[in-house]
């Protein structure tokens, strides 16, 4: 047994161009929190079960509001370590997923909205009891700096936390055949004899005579892989002529479920249905009641008032599993169209649409003239976040369906009278004025104040103004 510890040092824009926009704003203040998921990395099937080594959620960080115009700085972080306890041996090789989540604190319907800002993953070799290991991971334009270590919980010691130490019985030395427990030189390694034949690579024991398996291995001596690929080499385990025709053991072969649990294959893993009084990935944990809080992610625990009665977790939307430990990212298939931002609010999916788009899935293009008819010969003009019709003479309104009164705007100047006409309007000018809109005064001497005529035409030439 032991604890994996993760310390986040910073989360902010990575080096190089294209710095990300701050995830928070004055209108939408937010705070960050982190989730770490650990899986044993003993085989290609490290994803054999979700977060099989454990998972942890950090506290929420301080509320952050972006300063207008400022680039996104390193964002304020939650206090403290993320700690993932592990009950069995430390596998030595592990894979991790660290997620940075944003909690928006604006006026959200139905409570705060969570969205995933960044997810980094990796596979590392790490001995328990060693120093802090430092790491930098990038996700898009973001950069995460962190340290991690695995430490054993007493009395366990060693690189896998499988050796047990006991205080010395005599002050000077350990008993026959027993070594001092480094680094606890004042303690001795406990005499521990595992079941005969127990695999030294994949098995261990905490009590004499037992053989407990590391993640990914099963069988009485921990020699059977829980699930392997059906082909050990490109041609597989069968003859070179027939190719790979023998499916390997499935995840339920050898029944990894303890205490009478029944195993069923899931799309990528297995699931144990546990008898009353047991729970856990392999039904290995007993005597759990609702008082122990076995339901994660806000799941509601029902029943299980005493250790002999089963409890049931009723999971909130977006989570599943017997303990509501599996998160379902319903945004994964990008349900928001046209570049809309998907928010999984738990109780519902919400799309935040880009400018110019609307609808529950941002499916409506507000600028789109396609399929929007402008009546009576009008033409559709895109722009301004909404389509608009430029109407033919004599028509008006949003879709050019209304007959326009061409004289309504009083277009005839200087007291001219307006007459509506099928082709537009006609102005009858008051004495002393002329032009299509009666805009030009006629001088008493017969000369007009019209613009200069082109060469070859005299001002007042009747051809010019017919």
């Amino acid at each position: 047994a032991g604890v994996f510890e993760l310390q986040i040092h910073s989360f902010g824009p990575g080096p190089g161009p294209g710095a990300p926009r701050s995830p928070c704003s004055a209108r939408l203040p937010c705070r960050l929190f982190f989730r770490v998921c650990l899986k044993p990395g003993l085989s290609e099937e490290a994803a054999e079960s979700p977060c099989a080594l454990g998972a942890a959620l950090s506290a929420r960080g301080p509320v952050y509001t972006e300063q207008p115009g400022a680039p996104a700085p390193d964002l304020p972080l939650p206090d403290g370590l993320l700690q993932v306890p592990f009950r069995d041996a430390w596998p030595g090789t592990f894979s991790f997923i660290i997620e940075t989540w944003r909690e928006e604190l604006g006026d959200q319907i139905g409570g705060p909205a969570w969205s995933l800002l960044a997810r980094v993953a990796g596979r590392r070799r790490l001995a328990a009891g060693g120093p802090w290991a430092r790491d930098i991971q990038r996700a898009g334009a973001w950069e995460l700096r962190f340290s991690y270590r695995a430490r054993c919980e007493p009395p366990a010691v060693g690189t896998a936390c499988t050796r047990l130490c006991r205080p010395r019985s005599a002050p000077s030395r350990c008993g026959p055949g027993l070594r001092p427990c480094a680094p606890l030189e004042d303690e001795c390694e406990a005499p521990l004899v595992c079941r005969a034949g127990c695999s030294p690579e994949h098995g261990f024991c905490e009590q004499p005579g037992e053989c407990r398996c590391l993640e990914g291995w099963t069988g009485p001596l921990c020699t059977v892989p829980v699930s392997t690929s059906s082909c050990l080499s490109p041609r597989g385990p069968s003859s070179a002529t027939t190719g790979c025709l023998v499916p390997g053991p499935g995840p339920c072969d050898g029944n990894p479920c303890a205490n009478g649990g029944s195993c069923s294959e899931t799309p990528r893993s297995f699931e144990c249905t546990c008898p009353r009084g047991f729970y856990g990935l392999r039904c290995e944990v007993s005597g759990v009641t609702c008082a122990d809080g076995p339901c994660f992610n806000g799941g509601l625990c029902v029943g299980g008032a005493d250790p002999d009665s089963a409890y049931i977790c009723h999971c909130p939307p977006g989570f599943q599993g017997s303990n509501c430990e599996k998160r379902v990212d319903r945004c994964s298939l990008q349900p928001c169209r046209n570049g809309g931002l998907c928010l999984d609010l738990g109780h519902a999916l919400r799309c935040r649409c880009r400018a110019g788009f609307a609808g529950p899935r941002c499916e409506h293009d507000l600028d789109d003239c396609a399929g929007r008819a402008c009546a009576n010969g009008g033409t559709c003009v895109e722009g301004g976040g909404a389509h608009r019709c430029s109407c033919a003479l004599g028509f008006g309104g949003r879709d050019c369906r209304e007959r326009a009164d061409p004289c309504a705007a009083r277009p005839c100047a200087h007291g001219g009278r307006c007459y509506a006409h099928f082709s537009g309007l006609v102005c009858a000018c008051a004495p002393g004025y002329m032009g299509a809109r009666c805009e030009f005064p006629v001088h008493p001497d017969g000369a007009s104040a019209l613009p200069a005529a082109p060469p070859g035409l005299r001002p007042g030439d009747p051809q010019r103004y017919l």
């Epitope: 490290a46 690929s229 990528r268 599996k326 379902v328 994964s332």
Partner: antibody, heavy 124, light 106 residues
Framework: QITLKESGPTLVKPTQTLTLTCTFS??????????VGWIRQPPGKALEWLAH???????RYSPSLKSRLTITKDTSKNQVVLTMTNMDPVDTATYYC????????????????WGQGTLVTVSS | DIQMTQSPSSLSASVGDRVTITCSAS?????MYWYQQKPGKAPKLLIY???NLASGVPSRFSGSGSGTDFTLTISSLQPEDFATYYC?????????FGQGTKLEIK
């Protein structure tokens, strides 16, 4: 644009082995979260899931057909191969391959793109 | 094995009708998936994770339900909606489909 296409023999004799290939484009089986599955449909009947394979070589087989099925992938060729031994006339069906997506450990998001299918007849 | 039972097996309806197809699982499943299939064509994903519309699927389709009982609803039938509809679960192996519901023009 994502496409999948099934290929293989249209006529197979009883007891023979059927080998079907699914060639796909627009996604890669080296990408985390991606899988390819096989589904069949006898004439006039319902769909039946047969097997699937994930990017990390995790495989699942229908328990009733497990002893006869093998699924493999060739990531570099963008191909998934399904082998079915000891064919019988009741195996006459249209065989489809489809992309499967899982972004959440053990939760399938969707089986969202399908090939057009290939009709395999088992007859002597 | 989890059995999926669709009802009705077939139904006749008219353009503009509101239609509901149900899928009942023999034991609890977390999510339901719905597909539409037209004669001679491959199935097409309609709904994933119980209630999410697949890309390009009109908003007249919707999905709901939890546990063992799930529903596919078409709010106003269009001529192109006449097809066979299948439900499917991904809870445990085998990942079975329903027997199908054939939607015909009245």
């Amino acid at each position: 644009q994502i496409t999948l296409k099934e290929s293989g023999p249209t006529l197979v004799k009883p007891t023979q082995t059927l080998t079907l290939t699914c060639t796909f484009s627009g996604f890669s089986l080296s990408t985390s979260g991606m899988g390819v599955g096989w589904i069949r449909q006898p004439p006039g009947k319902a769909l039946e899931w047969l097997a699937h394979i994930w990017w990390d070589d995790v495989k699942r087989y229908s328990p009733s057909l497990k002893s006869r099925l093998t699924i493999t992938k060739d990531t570099s060729k963008n191909q998934v191969v399904l082998t079915m031994t000891n064919m019988d006339p009741v195996d006459t069906a249209t065989y489809y391959c489809a992309r499967i997506v899982s972004f959440d450990n053990d939760v399938v998001s969707a089986m969202d793109y399908w090939g057009q299918g290939t009709l395999v007849t088992v007859s002597s | 094995d989890i059995q999926m039972t669709q009802s009705p097996s077939s139904l006749s309806a008219s353009v503009g009708d509101r239609v509901t197809i149900t899928c009942s699982a023999s034991s609890s499943v977390s999510y339901m998936y719905w597909y539409q299939q037209k004669p001679g064509k491959a199935p097409k994903l309609l709904i994933y994770l119980t209630s999410n519309l697949a890309s390009g699927v009109p908003s007249r389709f919707s999905g709901s339900g939890s546990g063992t009982d799930f529903t596919l609803t078409i709010s106003s039938l269009q001529p192109e909606d006449f097809a066979t509809y299948y439900c499917q679960h991904w809870r445990s192996n085998p990942f079975t489909f329903g027997q199908g519901t054939k939607l015909e023009i009245k």
